[in-house]
């Protein structure tokens, strides 16, 4: 039942999680943990925020969005196969057992082997296409080669990301971005 996200070895993985603060600066503590959300708190915490700031993080895990506006999406830098698994985003809403909990499944795939350069690729390299991908970390701008290369790598990755981002669709379609207060 977890929402699934994908990345390749060596890329940055992006796991979305959002809430809407009741007022600007009126933040809610959030924790990210490796493993499904337990009943209370987060297990194996990799990053935590409090009412003011990120107060705990481990290497390679960071928040690239504006967490002060409720974007607490997790970026995992330079992923390896060992990063595969379920991650818990827990929005610690004040109250008794009132937290919002999201289990997100990260699937890491081996890096694609880039084929040897061809004459066509040499030609198009003089006119590189630019594609900015949001889904793999901090607005990485990647220079891409020929159209076949785009289709095989970036577009398929983006298509997978769009297809797999059921959480984002749910949030959009049902108005389920969490509003505090």
């Amino acid at each position: 039942s977890e929402v699934e996200y994908r990345a390749e070895v060596g890329q940055n993985a992006y796991l979305p999680c959002f809430y809407t603060p009741a007022a600007p600066g009126n933040l809610v503590p959030v924790c990210w943990g490796k493993g499904a959300c337990p009943v209370f708190e987060c297990g194996n915490v990799v990053l935590r925020t409090d009412e003011r700031d990120v107060n705990y993080w481990t290497s390679r895990y960071w928040l690239n969005g504006d967490f002060r506006k409720g974007d607490v999406s997790l970026t995992i830098e330079n992923v390896t196969l060992a990063d595969s698994g379920i991650y818990c985003c827990r929005i610690q809403i004040p109250g008794i057992m009132n937290d919002e909990k999201f289990n997100l499944k990260l699937v890491i795939k081996p890096a694609k082997v880039t084929p040897a350069p061809t004459r066509q690729r040499d030609f198009t390299a003089a006119f590189p296409r630019m594609l900015t991908t949001r889904g793999h970390g901090p607005a990485e701008t990647q220079t891409l080669g020929s159209l076949p290369d785009i289709n095989l790598t970036q577009i398929s990755t983006l298509a997978n990301e769009l297809r797999d981002s059921r959480l984002a669709n749910d949030l959009r379609d049902s108005g389920a971005t969490i509003r505090i207060g």
């Epitope: 008794i96 057992m97 937290d99 289990n103």
Partner: antibody
């Protein structure tokens, strides 16, 4: 706004199964805990169990001796409680709650032949 | 299971009085204690969580304190609308357990 509504038969015969449904709205159903609590007439509150609709995890009050089963239907934003082999002692108002902060109005169930 | 004892079981006080209810857990519950107000025919309403944190919108005359096994709920100045039964709840571990309740009325 967050709303929960319990529904089910008001009268159940002894030894039968009590079935209640809790319909939730106003929030992301799969991301929040649901608790069930009951209150016999003129008595205090008793916790029945907990379910997390996101993955179906459950916890139960051992005092119910495995008679309770909690489940969810995510497509309908509904949580369900089944209580087997009921007796007069199960007569109560049954509440569902999101976490324990937002409660339904309660559903009165009488066990009688 | 963690047992919760609550006292008194009932009390009568005058409008404006300070009212105190205590709740004791059979073991340390790490401040995972809530207080609820229930009026006849209504669902319980959360007033306090984590022992001393007031739920948004709840009047400031309600307060909670305590740690470990011993907790206190206070109404600093009793109002007519505060007539209700008050319950404590431990949510440190399953099964969750409520205190038996304290019925508060006006003299």
């Amino acid at each position: 706004q967050v709303q929960l509504q319990e529904s089910g038969p008001g009268l159940v015969k002894p030894s039968e199964t009590l079935s209640l449904t809790c319909t939730a709205s106003g929030y992301t159903f799969t991301s929040s805990d649901i608790n069930w609590v009951r209150q016999p007439p003129g008595k205090g509150l008793e916790w029945i169990g907990w379910i997390f609709p996101g993955d179906g995890s459950t916890k139960y009050n051992p005092s119910l001796k495995s008679r309770a089963t909690l489940s969810t239907d995510k497509s309908k934003n509904q949580a369900s409680l089944n209580l087997d082999s009921v007796s007069a002692a199960d007569t109560a108002i049954y509440f569902c709650a999101r976490g324990l902060d937002y409660w339904g109005k309660g559903s009165t169930v009488t066990v009688s032949s | 299971d963690i047992q919760m004892t609550q006292s008194p079981s009932s009390l009568s006080a005058s409008v404006g009085d300070r009212v105190t209810i205590t709740c004791k857990a059979s073991q340390d519950i790490n401040s995972y204690l809530g207080w609820f107000q229930q009026k006849p025919g209504k669902a319980p309403k959360t007033l306090i969580y984590r022992a001393d944190r007031l739920v948004d919108g709840v009047p400031s005359r309600f307060s909670g304190s305590g740690s470990g096994q011993d907790y206190t709920f206070t109404i600093s100045s009793l109002q007519p609308e505060d007539i209700a039964t008050y319950y404590c709840l431990q949510y440190d571990e399953f099964p969750l357990t409520f205190g038996p309740g304290t019925k508060v009325d006006i003299k």
